[in-house]
Interface confidence: low
Amino acid sequence: DAHKSEVAHRFKDLGEENFKALVLIAFAQYLQQCPFEDHVKLVNEVTEFAKTCVADESAENCDKSLHTLFGDKLCTVATLRETYGEMADCCAKQEPERNECFLQHKDDNPNLPRLVRPEVDVMCTAFHDNEETFLKKYLYEIARRHPYFYAPELLFFAKRYKAAFTECCQAADKAACLLPKLDELRDEGKASSAKQRLKCASLQKFGERAFKAWAVARLSQRFPKAEFAEVSKLVTDLTKVHTECCHGDLLECADDRADLAKYICENQDSISSKLKECCEKPLLEKSHCIAEVENDEMPADLPSLAADFVESKDVCKNYAEAKDVFLGMFLYEYARRHPDYSVVLLLRLAKTYETTLEKCCAAADPHECYAKVFDEFKPLVEEPQNLIKQNCELFEQLGEYKFQNALLVRYTKKVPQVSTPTLVEVSRNLGKVGSKCCKHPEAKRMPCAEDYLSVVLNQLCVLHEKTPVSDRVTKCCTESLVNRRPCFSALEVDETYVPKEFNAETFTFHADICTLSEKERQIKKQTALVELVKHKPKATKEQLKAVMDDFAAFVEKCCKADDKETCFAEEGKKLVAASQAALGL
């Protein structure tokens, strides 16, 4: 239904608080370097304007699209050219090109200072002094660092953030109450951001069809009792929501997500038996809960897939009449029967099925040609199963830190051109698959592990896209969304790589390492490990282990010394010399 004023429509639907929060998120995700105060000012102006449109939808400019209104507002920032360089050229374009231009300039790795957590008392004072500004700052800081964060979900995080401070700032031991909650929000937030980044990459790089295929598979696993028509409706609506959020249309996205949650809850009897608790919650919690809901039980008497998709004489006829619908039904039927498969595996199977039908339906005897199609699935299923089995065994043997180190070495050898911080970040996250998924029983391991790895490898892909340095990374990232993980797994040591010149400065450490948290200390050591591999790509596991053990002992020794700085200087020189000797540098 067309509204005279889109901005008034969204303001009324969302309410002032959510409207302001979403506009702040949108602006911070576009102009990631702008100061908080500037964004607040812009948001206040937009909000005041929206109120004039609510009062009179025919008022001047109220009929303009949200992109026009928001784009005009962003283009008034005086320092656009100095701060953002060529992004300022977007302002010379007309909609919709201007918004596309802004989207292209979103930076997945903005040059922003690390968020340092102040003392608990300082945070609680700030929270009590001005709760509204405190929460706005949270939205702003997360949004500008995560320009694709799922906006309605960020409202949910902000609500939990507020609840944590409300509860803990009046607790006897504020820190014991608050810090674990903030750690949990931080970790969940990073995971949520990365998951949404994959959805946006899927839509933007591989198109709506790829996203819809992913959604059919995932929703069919989650709601196996729902009929295909119901799943298709949910997929269409979900695709609209994510297309809007990934496109910067956050007000529409949040509004449509709320409508989708409402629809799901009104129709839960025909969707899933697991939704009851979710649907009793308030809106933000309800939407989050639905998105995370466990898979419903599979219907008991599902017939064999072969009847409709292999044995039937009508396979080619059905395929020819409506290819995507028929493939969608195949994916739906396969996925609802296989909650034990990863979504990406299901999509590989569907792709194999499609390729086989394309070939066979043009053959002299189509049925003879595609009769053995399910046999082709066997190696596709076994490959991730074996990989997960091997890596979980390695994880259980080594523990998370050393497992991460093994992956660091593996991936640095595969793609040594990638920057050290990116290799450390991505390998650390790849290594977390162990503690996240290996504890699960066999039936849950693959969906946990392989779909998580897809999210992490997408981080590598988006970071690499910003400054491409490796043809191999580009190839694995762009050729096929569902085959990214097998593509990276198949990479061997890059024999073309010319080892990096040895630089002693890279391996010079100071006493400040002693005051770092365990996590930060690990990152320092892992950074050194990547650099070692870049210097000596052919180093054996044993050589690298010896050097890293020496390094750990060196840090431990100097951190216990009275004169730490002198120890780091003198022992450090010895360590570098010994390492060079050990590696034959």
């Epitope: 607040v40 000012k41 812009l42 206040n44 102006e45 937009v46 005041e48 304007f49 004039t52 009062a55 001047e60 400019n61 209104l69 005009d72 507002k73 283009c75 008034t76 920032v77 005086a78």
Partner: antibody, heavy 120, light 110 residues
């Protein structure tokens, strides 16, 4: 460099008309609303009127009818009719902070002002 | 029309002192209020907008607060360069007369 510069004849006889000009540089009038403010000697600031990015005008009640604001691509004009001695003042042009949909914002950039004296 | 009433109209204070100037709007203007500083023979300078947001380059000793009809400007510790005249100004979107200035407060050295 972003700046505003007012100019115009300083002395005018009572009941006469006068135009003063504000020349802008370093930004576009299609992005910012422009406002005229005056300050009689030893007195406070008085808002005269504003011209929006789209060229619409808005005046203080006391200024309606006698004062009119217009603009071209780089200049903003204030035309004053039937001037009286109590119109003697320093006349400033000022730019809004950012374009706002209703074109009313704080005044973040001011010209140096031009003194208009109405005297016989 | 909105009328802005500023008080006091003049004020004497010493270096290092904390001073507060108030401004009252005849009807609610939300947070749409700015504060300016003007020194003799000089152009006005923006200090605060949206009632409490400090303009860039303005020292942190200047603090604005309030919303609706009651607003204040506080200077936490007077410096020699702060002796000037201060004006509040509303910018109301819904009003046909968009802007209204207060009468000014002259801050003098004691």
């Amino acid at each position: 460099q972003v700046q505003l510069k007012e100019s115009g004849p300083g002395l005018v006889a009572p009941s006469q008309s006068l135009s003063i000009t504000c020349t802008v540089s370093g930004f576009s009038l299609s992005r910012y609303a422009m406002t005229w403010v005056r300050q009689p000697p030893g007195k406070g600031l008085e808002w005269i009127g504003t011209i929006t990015t789209g060229g619409n005008t808005n005046y203080a009640n006391w200024a309606k009818g006698r004062f009119s604001i217009s603009k071209d691509s780089t200049q903003v004009f204030l035309k004053m009719n039937s001037l009286q001695t109590d119109d003697t003042a320093m006349y400033y042009c000022a730019r809004g902070g950012y374009v706002s949909y209703a074109d009313a914002t704080e005044l973040s950039l001011w010209g140096q002002g031009t003194l208009v004296t109405v005297s016989s | 029309d909105i009328v802005m009433t500023q008080s006091p109209s003049s004020l004497s204070a010493s270096l290092g002192e904390r001073v507060t100037i108030t401004c009252q709007a005849s009807q609610s203007i939300g947070s749409r209020l700015a504060w300016y500083q003007q020194k003799p023979g000089k152009t006005p300078k923006l200090l605060i907008f949206y009632a409490s947001t400090v303009a860039s380059g303005v020292p942190s000793r200047f603090k604005g607060s309030g919303s609706g009809t009651e607003f204040s400007l506080t200077i936490s510790s007077l410096q020699p360069e702060d002796f000037a005249t201060y004006y509040c100004q509303s910018y109301d979107y819904s009003s046909s007369s968009s802007y209204a200035f207060g009468g000014g407060t002259k801050l003098e050295i004691k």
